[in-house]
Amino acid sequence: MAVTACQGLGFVVSLIGIAGIIAATCMDQWSTQDLYNNPVTAVFNYQGLWRSCVRESSGFTECRGYFTLLGLPAMLQAVRALMIVGIVLGAIGLLVSIFALKCIRIGSMEDSAKANMTLTSGIMFIVSGLCAIAGVSVFANMLVTNFWMSTANMYTGMGGMVQTVQTRYTFGAALFVGWVAGGLTLIGGVMMCIACRGLAPEETNYKAVSYHASGHSVAYKPGGFKASTGFGSNTKNKKIYDGGARTEDEVQSYPSKHDYV
């Protein structure tokens, strides 16, 4: 029962997380105009991964897409790629995990197959979450760098007479949505991996071992120990795995180098 609950909860949490990653990717407010120096602006600027927008106090909002591909900063392209990879992996993970759910019966699918699918989807969710967190973090880092660069030369003037305030950008709502969504997807993935351990109908047979103590001839012979977890599993379909407990696959993320433009 606990395994089913863990798997189900992992699926739901990942589903919410991936929906959040999709929402964050589509959102226009990745960076918003910093109003610290001009809190009473009649024009508010904000930017997303795909377009930049200007909202006037009149209520009129104008958005312009980034129609160029080569002219965009490499960092922005990298963030787009990370978010899309996260969405794709998450979507595939969701598809796999639906068939892996213990509450759904598909023909005579064995528990071992469901366990493998649960593990696969779990890993996909973990990588998906990491991609989203990495993407959002890269963008946030880019914002922080640009923020302090623009602060350094905030005011440029003609003989000190005319002020030209450079527009600075700060964290937008999409960043927080992305971080939370990435975190949820990651947690969901971990839960799926935990559920996989319970789903696997492991039956480990320990071979009889004789221990010969000096001066004594006492043999310790433990019987075949059956480790079986998983509620309501069909024992006649169980396969016996020899050679100890299985470990979860490790997710390795390879750092990639992107240049600022």
Epitope: V40, A42, N45, C53, S57, S58, F60, E62, T164
Partner: antibody
């Protein structure tokens, strides 16, 4: 057709109060920011105050801050300007205008209501 | 606050003449987000309410004759009337619509000889 009709003007004693109204029609009042602009006799235009569509943002000119209060009643399509502690320099024609157009431009203006502050 | 300085304060021209008036801002009215200047020009004929002529510093409002041209960027703006007509007798105001308070210039009065 967009129409803005101001009312509530008249003669007021210094230190007195007055409430101006602006009835709007011909457009979705609740979707647009509204402004008050005044013009003293033989003088130029002076922006007075602004209120956003949902009353979330309200801004005032420094000359009226703390004395004037701007509000709106969206269901009744009406804009209000409550003026207190009136001074002789507040004597002007008060126009209500809307940022109906692009670029925060004040496209539609009312005919104005005259406020005279005098003893 | 943004201070707008209009010059000259008054102009006397003959019909058919080309006229230009200036509006200088104490701060830049250029918005990098959409590459637009948030300066508006209004016309106020004697005894009438102001009417919008130009927004975004150079975009004519529909219905405004093409003899009216707005130009400039950042802090320096100009309103040009190519062939002045009798009906153009009015006071012309520029307005900062970039940050609150939305200040107006003192105006340029256009008179005909």
């Amino acid at each position: 057709d967009v129409q803005l009709v101001e009312s509530g003007g008249g003669l007021v004693q210094p230190g007195g109060s007055r409430k101006l109204s602006c009835a709007a029609s011909g457009f979705t009042f609740s979707s647009f920011g509204m402004h008050w602009v005044r013009q003293a006799p033989e003088k130029g235009l002076e922006w007075v105050a602004y209120i956003s569509s949902g009353s979330g943002s309200i801004y005032y000119a420094d000359t009226v801050k703390g004395r004037f209060t701007l509000s709106r009643d969206n269901p009744k399509n009406t804009l209000f300007l409550q003026m207190t502690s009136l001074r002789s320099e507040d004597t002007a024609i008060y126009y209500c205008a809307t940022s109906y157009y692009y670029g925060n431009a004040l496209e539609y203006w009312g005919q104005g209501t005259s406020v005279t502050v005098s003893s | 606050d943004v201070v707008l300085t209009q010059s000259p304060s008054s102009l006397t021209v003959t019909e058919g003449e080309k006229v230009s008036m200036s509006c200088k801002s104490s701060q830049s009215l250029f918005n990098s987000g959409n590459q637009k200047n948030y300066l508006t020009w209004y016309q106020q004929k004697p005894g009438q309410t102001p009417t919008l002529l130009i927004y975004w510093a150079s975009t004519r409002k529909s219905g405004v004759p093409d003899r009216f041209t707005g130009s400039g960027s950042g802090t320096d703006f100009t309103l040009t009337i190519n062939t002045v007509q009798a009906e153009d007798l009015a006071v012309y105001y520029c307005q900062n619509v970039y940050s609150y308070p939305l200040t107006f210039g003192a105006g340029t009065k256009l008179d005909l000889k």
